[in-house]
Interface confidence: low
């Protein structure tokens, strides 16, 4: 869609005559008829396929035509078309004399024609006017013309419709060729896509208007590059949304359970080693010479009866010293120079020869231990009672006297959820703020240690000195069969040659 514009500039008819040569009386009151049509090699009569327009009387004989575009739009003359401009045309301009006020063709005498011009050619759409002048024997017409597109039409043929907009359907103005030119901050084929804030995360962020960065669920921060941890996550972080990966020393679903009582409270005294054993519980491993829940009590190093085989313990400033009975030697009198002939096994222990009689091993009756069955089993030496419980020897067994708030064989349970012993197969119950947790012994799994999983007690290679390991499947324990020259439950002690004694 566009408009063919014709600007009449000057008409010269000095003698004031008609095309027939007859003069106009009193002068030639001149008006114009314009016919615009498709291109014809020879312009011939016929329909004005692109349109027609007529002017009022513009002057008498010779006159300049005023540019009247601002006041009514009669000059330039407008010939609108609503099709693709073909680029070629034919134009007929006729000058007529109007004896009266009626300018209709049928009201004029046939010889009222003053002059007629016809041109044809190519014409591209554009803002520039083409100036032309046509001269006949008696008249001269100066005019210019051009083709421009109607509002919202663009392109070489005025065939591209483009209407600037700034709404949900697009944010653009139109270029001279009809292509869209996005308004600042918008992009895409129809300029509907906003350009997000610089650095806004491609996947986790988006925007609905320019320079904005809105976060998708689970993400936060100015550029939507920070994940949101699980709601209620206290001492934890995330790498993807809704995670709660606990900081060191914290546990539980929301990382709100203090698993590092040792670090946070340093309860163990006198250089003892602290081990976390569940939420808010711990165990102190005392250095030699100390005892107590927190290793706060000093003891004689001989109190732990370190000397075996009847050796006598002597306290020294820097530790202790074992005075071994005849036939024994070593730091703890652990090595024997005796054989079964010397009846080395105390308390009814049975003697078994080893290494063709060069060595022996004692098999102790219940409640006795040591390489010569010399020690009554003190089941409290391993400090088995947790959470500050006091260990008491009771004949062949032991028992733990628990501090208030704890229960269980080893005082390992907090009184509350763990009171009903929910953990099967000897699982250790930990009382948490929002429930309990079972720590299962080897060979068991599941929330309550209810699932039995077979384990190979020999998998950790517990036997030394190339001893053969056997797994007892009924108890999931191991037995080491020692080669000649080694003794001990793990075959860890070599049997040396008898030293020379002074007695």
């Amino acid at each position: 869609s566009g408009v063919f514009q014709l600007q009449l500039q000057e008409f010269i008819n000095e003698r004031g005559v008609l095309a027939s040569g007859r003069p106009c009386e009193p002068g030639c009151r001149t008006f114009f008829r314009v016919c615009l049509k498709h291109f014809q090699a020879v312009v011939s009569p016929g329909p004005c396929t692109f349109g027609t327009v007529s002017t009022p009387v513009l002057g008498t004989n010779s006159f300049a035509v005023r540019d009247d575009s601002s006041g009514g739009g009669r000059n330039p003359l407008q010939l609108p078309f609503n099709f693709t401009w073909p680029g070629t045309f034919s134009l007929i301009i006729e000058a007529w004399h109007a004896p009266g006020d009626d300018l209709r063709p049928e009201a004029l005498p046939p010889d009222a024609l003053i002059s007629k011009i016809a041109i044809q050619g190519s014409l591209a759409v554009g803002q520039n006017w083409l100036l032309d002048e046509q001269t006949s024997t008696l008249t001269r017409l100066r005019y210019s013309y051009r083709v421009i597109c109607s509002d919202n039409y663009y392109g070489d043929n005025c065939s591209r419709l483009c209407k600037k907009r700034n709404d949900h359907f697009g944010h653009y103005v139109c270029q001279p060729d009809g292509n869209l030119s996005c308004l600042p901050g918008w992009t895409g084929e129809y300029c509907q896509q906003p350009i997000c804030l610089s650095g806004c995360h491609e996947q986790n962020g988006y925007c609905s208007k320019p320079a904005e960065c809105l976060c998708r669920p689970g993400w936060q921060g100015r550029l939507c590059n920070e994940c949101i941890p699980h709601n209620g996550c206290r001492h934890g972080t995330c790498s993807t949304p809704w995670q709660c990966t606990c900081d060191e020393g914290w546990g539980g679903l929301f990382c709100d359970q203090d698993l590092n009582y040792c670090t946070h409270h340093s309860p163990c005294k006198n250089g003892a080693t602290c081990s976390n054993s569940g939420q808010r519980s711990y165990t102190c491993t005392c250095r030699p010479g100390y005892t107590g829940v927190d290793c706060e009590l000093e003891l004689s190093e001989c109190d732990s009866n370190p000397c075996r085989n009847g050796g006598s313990c002597k306290d020294q400033e820097d530790g202790y010293h074992c005075l071994c009975p005849p036939g024994y030697y070593g730091l703890h009198c652990e090595h024997s120079t005796l054989s079964c002939a010397d009846s080395p096994c105390f308390n009814g222990g049975s003697c078994r020869e080893r290494n063709q009689g060069a060595n022996y091993a004692c098999e102790c009756p219940p409640n006795f231990t040591g390489s010569n069955c010399e020690k009554k089993v003190d089941r409290c030496t391993s400090n088995p009672c947790a959470n500050g419980g006091q260990c008491l020897n009771r004949g062949p067994s032991r028992m733990c006297r628990c501090r208030p708030g704890f229960t269980g064989t080893y005082c390992e349970l907090h009184v509350s959820d763990c009171a009903r012993n929910p953990c099967a197969h000897g699982g250790t119950c930990h009382d948490l703020e929002n429930g309990l947790m079972c720590t299962c012994p080897a060979g068991f799994s599941g929330r309550r240690c209810e699932v039995r999983t077979s384990i190979d007690a020999c998998a950790s290679s517990p036997c030394f000195n190339r001893a053969t390991c056997y797994t007892d499947l009924s108890t999931d324990t191991f037995v080491c069969n020692c080669p000649y020259g080694f003794v001990g439950s793990r075959c860890e002690f070599p049997v040396g040659l008898p030293p020379s004694f002074p007695w």
Partner: antibody, heavy 119, light 108 residues
């Protein structure tokens, strides 16, 4: 003829601010954007951000986010870029360029403004 | 951020030779958002190619842009003395918009 004319050379002390202007002519300023690019001596081109002369929206490169402000004055068809808390490594030629929104290319460019930061 | 890597860093050729300059993006970008600029000493950059393959107004047809995805190329068919300069590629598919480090085309 479309062109951008920038303000002249500036010498600043560390910690100071600089405001460079860029006057546009030959096109409808408010239907376009202005982008700012800098070039340190002997180095490549570094994009700093853009401003829409249409509605004042801005997009700054993260590196400059805390100390840059871009503005426009549509009555004079002028864009401004202010950089605060200047450091010696801000010494560079600062260019403005018209931003053609539907394809994001920069054409034409201003002649450049040399900013020297030295104590 | 998308990193644009140009190669070679320097190209030494004689007038009349052909030149091929490469630009690689660290991730795929639409060719619509890839431009090439020429910069001569002491001057502002000048737009050569936009949309990966369209010559800007007034740019001679000896300059040709091609490529898609992550690999783009600027080809100069017959070097004229005035073509010796630094060439930069630039992407604006993803904010922040980034330039390559440049290829210096020098006379051998």
């Amino acid at each position: 003829q479309v062109q951008l004319v920038q303000s002249g050379t500036e010498v600043k002390k560390p910690g100071a601010s600089v405001k460079v202007s860029c006057k546009a002519s030959g096109y409808t300023f408010s239907y376009n954007g202005v982008t700012w690019v800098r070039q340190a001596p002997g180095q490549g081109l570094e994009w700093m951000g853009w401003i829409s002369a249409y509605d004042g929206n801005t997009d700054y490169a993260q590196k400059f986010q805390d100390r840059i402000t871009m503005t426009t004055d549509t009555s004079t068809s002028t864009a401004y870029m202010e950089l605060r808390s200047l450091r010696s490594d801000d010494t560079a030629v600062y260019y403005c360029a018209r931003y053609s929104w539907n394809n994001h290319w920069f054409d034409p460019w201003g002649q450049g403004t040399l900013v020297t930061v030295s104590s | 951020d998308i990193v644009m890597t140009q190669s070679p860093g320097t190209l030494s050729l004689s007038p009349g030779d052909g030149a091929t300059l490469s630009c690689r993006a660290s991730q795929s970008v639409s060719g619509s958002y890839l431009a090439w600029y020429q910069q001569k000493p002491g001057q502002a950059p000048r737009l050569l190619i936009y949309g990966a393959s369209n010559r800007a107004t007034g740019i001679p047809d000896r300059f040709t842009g091609s490529g898609s995805g992550t690999d783009f190329t600027l080809t100069i068919s017959r070097l004229e003395p005035e073509d010796f300069a630094v060439y930069f590629c630039q992407q604006s598919a993803f904010s922040p918009w980034t330039f390559g480090q440049g290829t210096k085309l020098e006379i051998k």
